[in-house]
Amino acid sequence: GSVKVLHEPSCFSDYISTSVCQWKMDHPTNCSAELRLSYQLDFMGSENHTCVPENREDSVCVCSMPIDDAVEADVYQLDLWAGQQLLWSGSFQPSKHVKPRTPGNLTVHPNISHTWLLMWTNPYPTENHLHSELTYMVNVSNDNDPEDFKVYNVTYMGPTLRLAASTLKSGASYSARVRAWAQTYNSTWSDWSPSTTWLNYYEPWEQHLGLNDIFEAQKIEWHEHHHHHHHH
């Protein structure tokens, strides 16, 4: 039977090493066996390259294409083939379709003045255009209360966020995750980072607990919580 594309390829670039295209066929397809995505930079002397797609779902194919360090002028010619049959042809400019890499290594640390310090890593090396362009969204949610969640926009340079322990419920388990976007590139949001979980231990000021006592208690609680999770 005839091979047809239902939803044409949609492509995004991390603007450093990889572009990813995804499309949907009109019926279940063995993407790697039946299809090929050819791509070529519109630049004198550039060779044609071939990407072997993989299945994301029965009829959804995805192709990851290595690219050199992207620059604004780069435009790729894309051709989707089923054997000798050209199914779709289009162009793709990575700088106009940026999806940043996912921020990494999200950690939570007790900090001075009854605050939690959330830290993560910028996913781009300093020499990359996007390193200094990223802003972040941090989602903090109560693991046991779906309505207890907060969203923080981090628009300053450092990949950190300080949270007052008093803004969270005492004794509750919280999870945080972070994602990034690049405003000047009008990018989409990155994928969310893996969540990190911690127990918020906060006693009102009138309890006169010292900061060290609070954090010692927190460490004990966290240890028990962690232990509990590993045995159930």
């Epitope: 930079l41 002397g45 060779e47 690219i67």
Partner: antibody, heavy 125, light 112 residues
Framework: EVQLVESGGDLVKPGGSLRLSCVAS????????MTWVRQAPGKGLQWLSL????????YYADAVKGRFTISRDNAKNTLYLQMNSLRAEDTAVYYC??????????????????WGQGTLVTVSS | DIVMTQTPLSLSVSPGETASISCRSS???????????LDWYMQKPGQSPQGLIY???KRASGVSDRFSGSGSGADFTLKISRVEADDAGVYYC?????????FGQGTKLEIK
């Protein structure tokens, strides 16, 4: 040591044909685009044609498009220029030169970083 | 097609002085920041051309640091400082960005 040795230059009548060769050594030939440039007696340099490392992409100057064909045999490390329908104004020294590295997604450019010694083509009746 | 225009077409310089050659293109040769596809070549009588500068300002292997290239967009300059007798020859600029590639007319440098 990088070397490019052109051959095939000759005296040929107008309307005639000639094939120039350029044998390369000392670098990974298949990874680089190659270029032909010519120089008419007492004149400046004129770019003629470029071929990508795999041979899959070719480019020509308007003055030779349709008459000249660039090709390569990577197994023999040899670049060719097939010249048909030759005219008096094609009289020149023909140089081959190593151009950009095309095995990367965006070719890496170093200019025409090595040139052959040239071969003389004379078109005259 | 991109037109490359060199000035001056001939230049006479005393040893030890600085020679300056300009090259202007009819279109921008800047692909992205730091990537200006403009080269400079030198040719001595009876010899093949040799590369001096590529990407506007990068010296080719083995080229003296007396040779320097600058510029971006459509305006470029080759400077030869402390000119020596051996620098005599014809200097060409070439654009390497768009097909068809093209050379300037050449600048003949004479040493007084």
């Amino acid at each position: 040591e990088v070397q490019l040795v052109e051959s095939g230059g000759d005296l040929v009548k107008p309307g005639g044909s000639l094939r120039l060769s350029c044998v390369a050594s000392g670098f990974p030939f298949r990874d680089y685009a190659m270029t032909w440039v010519r120089q008419a007696p007492g004149k400046g340099l004129q770019w003629l044609s470029l071929i990508s490392g795999s041979g899959g992409k070719t480019y020509y100057a308007d003055a030779v498009k349709g008459r000249f064909t660039i090709s390569r045999d990577n197994a023999k490390n040899t670049l060719y220029l097939q010249m048909n329908s030759l005219r008096a104004e094609d009289t020149a020294v023909y140089y081959c030169a190593v151009d950009r590295l095309t095995k990367t997604i965006r070719p890496q450019y170093y200019g025409l970083w090595h040139w052959g010694q040239g071969t003389l083509v004379t078109v005259s009746s | 097609d991109i037109v490359m225009t060199q000035t001056p077409l001939s230049l006479s310089v005393s040893p030890g002085e600085t020679a300056s050659i300009s090259c202007r293109s009819s279109q921008s040769l800047t692909y992205s920041i730091g990537y200006n596809y403009l080269d400079w070549y030198m040719q001595k009588p009876g010899q093949s051309p040799q590369g001096l500068i590529y990407l506007g300002s990068k010296r080719a292997s083995g080229v003296s640091d007396r040779f320097s290239g600058s510029g971006s967009g459509a305006d470029f300059t080759l400077k030869i400082s402390r000119v020596e007798a051996d620098d005599a020859g014809v200097y060409y600029c070439m654009q390497g960005l768009h097909s068809p590639l093209g050379f300037g007319q050449g600048t003949k440098l004479e040493i007084k």
